[in-house]
């Protein structure tokens, strides 16, 4: 368990020609917040999949209004860190995006209107417990410069924060040099020692001896720079851990705490001590409010601070549910007529027509195969006084008005059902098998044929 | 414009027999559905009876339900309820509602009312 | 499998909140498979939320669904004279079997 960071230093205009002048105007003032979204090691280009490491929502920048002929300053940034928390190992590599809203606070019905200004996107190789690294991006005319790093939470350390850390004794018992680290309390354990001359910047190791490298540094000693592009890492702060311990049999092994909480042993079992947004005996009980960022894709959040009360996320266009984490697939609603093909630009749809048809949803006949257009993208084909239709990739029937069974190749494994949910097939298991296309059974006395079930699988339950 | 609609229902003497059909437009069974049938008694809360499977025609019975109550698939775009051995008890509005993942109704009939009486 | 469902009947103000539990004898199928309805006098039951979270599409971002396992919540958050109506929980469990909750009465003044 352990927490990204991320800090905003600046966000304006890039150099260069046709860069805008400013995000407001003297006739609308706006304010300025960010999003982070966190996925393990995908390529950026996977926009649509979650945020599976985690996201978090900056606070409102200060107001700003801009001055006619005076030159463009840096625009003003929220105060504070973008934080998130992540449960389990850091995965070294990650990808993330960042979103830059603009929040309007003209006299608009309804309250301020919000809009995506840039959203910039990378995958980096990062370590945890490293110093932080910086980073320039550019997204259009605008541009974006932060810097991130990646900390451990007592009592996870190391590069991936998967090993615990447990001081039981006293650091006057060990000598110089030596941590109180170790399962017993007469033991000590020697700092890791990295190849001498490793930069203590840009070099890291887990094993002693080795100098591996952070993003955009390269070399024997992590020293030379792989090109002056955006992956600098000056010294910042830095987050130092103290020391690790391959952990015994214990009550906390496998960290039972849910949602990044902390495990601490007691004298008959354990202890979670729990991060804000989380309660319960192993901090499984969710009391998220604003202040956690609850809200996607630009989800404009709005509820107490306090964790008793409740939160509503207002959702942009195109998004919904209670967190705005899903995009709405409204071309499923078949709005374009005759054929039509549909887009969702996300502010508006668009019908794009088949040949023959016209109107804002083509609505309007414009030749011989009128008053029998083909649905869904079906294609009409007249012959011998008749028609048929052909139909586009998942539709069949006379008019292509029946949706294909995305169910016909039997996914769900095992004898589970598959249903054609919208939004996208749906296994229910049979007894005694798990996993997304219940594909893994489930042993006899309820545990996974896995190590560790994965997000996502769905168990059948075995007692029955 | 998917819709569900009940028929079939209407008054019949204690120990009858009656039978409701549930007609799909807008869509037929040729996806893979749970066709369930839901009663609810007169103020009282609906009460799950049945299902059938469109993908396999394989049934399921709320415990209550076994023996006197019989889902099938006449065809593609009907599904029907036999009840035999009717009590008073049974007097109720019965719905017919679809799952199409997730374990929700999201699609539901108007309903037709059932009464068991003498 | 028996739902549960608690209070009965609740009352709130115009643009206050209303809290709904519905506790389970049993876990839901893959936790999370829990769905909730509004009902009003002579039409069927209406799908809110499903898989415990999930807004329905056209349903308003005041309702909010939480839990998992048995325990489960519904919010309404600024309630309308138009949310007056009876809610109900409902589960699908292993072995492909549903349960309705018994139901709560909602009044808004």
């Known amino acids: 368990a352990g927490v990204f960071e991320l800090q905003i230093h600046s966000f304006g205009p890039g150099p260069g020609p046709g860069a805008p002048r400013s995000p407001c105007s003297a006739r609308l003032p706006c304010r300025l917040f960010f999003r982070v979204c966190l996925k393990p090691g995908l390529s950026e280009e996977a926009a649509e999949s979650p945020c599976a490491l985690g996201a978090a929502l900056s606070a409102r920048g200060p107001v700003y209004t801009e001055q006619p002929g005076a030159p463009a300053p840096d625009l003003p940034l929220p105060d504070g860190l973008l934080q998130v928390p992540f449960r389990d190992a850091w995965p070294g590599t990650f990808s993330f995006i960042i979103e830059t809203w603009r929040e309007e606070l003209g006299d608009q019905i309804g309250g301020p209107a919000w809009s995506l200004l840039a959203r910039v996107a990378g995958r980096r190789r990062l370590a945890a417990g490293g110093p932080w690294a910086r980073d320039i991006q550019r997204a259009g005319a605008w541009e974006l410069r932060f810097s991130y790093r990646a900390r451990c939470e007592p009592p996870a350390v190391g590069t991936a924060c998967t090993r615990l850390c447990r001081p039981r004794s006293a650091p006057s018992r060990c000598g110089p040099g030596l941590r109180p680290c170790a399962p017993l309390e007469d033991e000590c354990e020697a700092p890791l020692v990295c190849r001498a001359g490793c930069s203590p910047e840009h070099g890291f190791c887990e094993q002693p001896g080795e100098c591996r490298c952070l993003e955009g540094w390269t070399g024997p000693l992590c020293t030379v720079p792989v090109s002056t592009s955006s992956c600098l890492s000056p010294r910042g702060p830095s987050s130092a851990t103290t020391g690790c311990l391959v952990p015994g049999p214990g009550p906390c092994d496998g960290n039972p705490c849910a949602n990044g909480g902390s495990c601490s042993e007691t004298p008959r079992s354990f202890e979670c001590t729990c991060p804000r947004g989380f309660y319960g005996l192993r901090c499984e009980v969710s009391g998220v409010t604003c202040a956690d960022g609850p809200c996607f894709n630009g989800g404009l959040c709005v509820g107490g601070a306090d964790p008793d009360s409740a939160y509503i996320c207002h959702c942009p266009p195109g998004f919904q549910g209670s967190n705005c984490e899903k995009r709405v697939d409204r071309c499923s609603l078949q709005p374009c007529r005759n054929g039509g093909l549909c887009l969702d630009l996300g502010h508006a749809l668009r019908c794009r027509c088949r040949a023959g048809f016209a109107g804002p949803r083509c609505e309007h006949d414009l030749d011989d195969c009128a008053g029998r257009a083909c649905a869904n993208g079906g294609t009409c084909v007249e012959g011998g006084g008749a028609h048929r239709c052909s139909c586009a990739l998942g539709f069949g029937g006379r008019d292509c008005r029946e949706r294909a069974d995305p169910c016909a190749a039997r996914p769900c494994a095992h004898g589970g059902r598959c249903y054609a949910h919208f939004s996208g097939l749906v296994c229910a298991c049979a007894p005694g098998y798990m996993g997304a296309r219940c594909e893994f059974p489930v042993h006899p006395d309820g545990a996974s044929a896995l190590p560790a079930a994965p997000p996502g699988l769905r168990p059948g339950d075995p007692q029955r | 414009q998917e819709q569900l609609v009940e028929s079939g229902g209407g008054l019949v003497q204690p120990e009858g027999s009656l039978t409701l059909t549930c007609t799909a437009s807008?869509?037929?069974?040729?996806?893979?559905?749970?066709m369930c049938w839901v009663r609810q008694a007169p103020g009282k809360g609906p009460e799950w009876i049945a299902c059938?499977?469109?993908?396999?025609?394989?049934t399921d019975y709320a415990s209550w339900a076994k023996g006197r109550f019989t889902v099938s698939k006449a065809s593609s775009t009907t599904v029907t309820l036999q009840m035999t051995s009717l009590a008073v008890a049974d007097t109720a509005t019965y719905f017919c509602?679809?799952?199409?993942?997730?374990?929700?109704?999201?699609?539901w009939g108007p309903g037709t009312l059932v009464t068991v009486s003498s | 499998q028996v739902l549960t469902q608690t209070p009965s009947p609740v009352s709130a103000a115009v643009g206050g909140t209303v809290t709904i539990s519905c506790q389970s004898t049993?876990?839901?199928?893959?936790?999370?498979?829990l769905s909730w309805y509004q009902q009003k006098p002579g039409q069927p039951p209406k799908v809110l939320i499903y898989?415990?979270?999930n807004l329905e599409i056209g349903v308003p971002s005041r309702f909010k669904g939480s839990g998992s396992g048995t325990q489960f919540t519904l919010t309404i958050s600024g309630a309308q004279c138009d949310d007056a109506a009876t809610y109900y929980c409902?589960?699908?469990?292993?072995?492909?079997?549903?349960?309705f909750g018994g139901g709560t009465e909602v009044v808004v003044k």
């Open positions: 807008g869509f037929s069974f040729s996806s893979s559905y749970d």
């Open positions: 049993e876990s839901v199928y893959g936790s999370d498979w």
């Open positions: 059938i499977y469109t993908g396999d025609g394989s």
């Open positions: 898989q415990a979270s």
């Open positions: 409902q589960g699908y469990y292993s072995g492909y079997i549903y349960a």
């Open positions: 509602a679809r799952n199409s993942g997730y374990g929700y109704f999201g699609l």
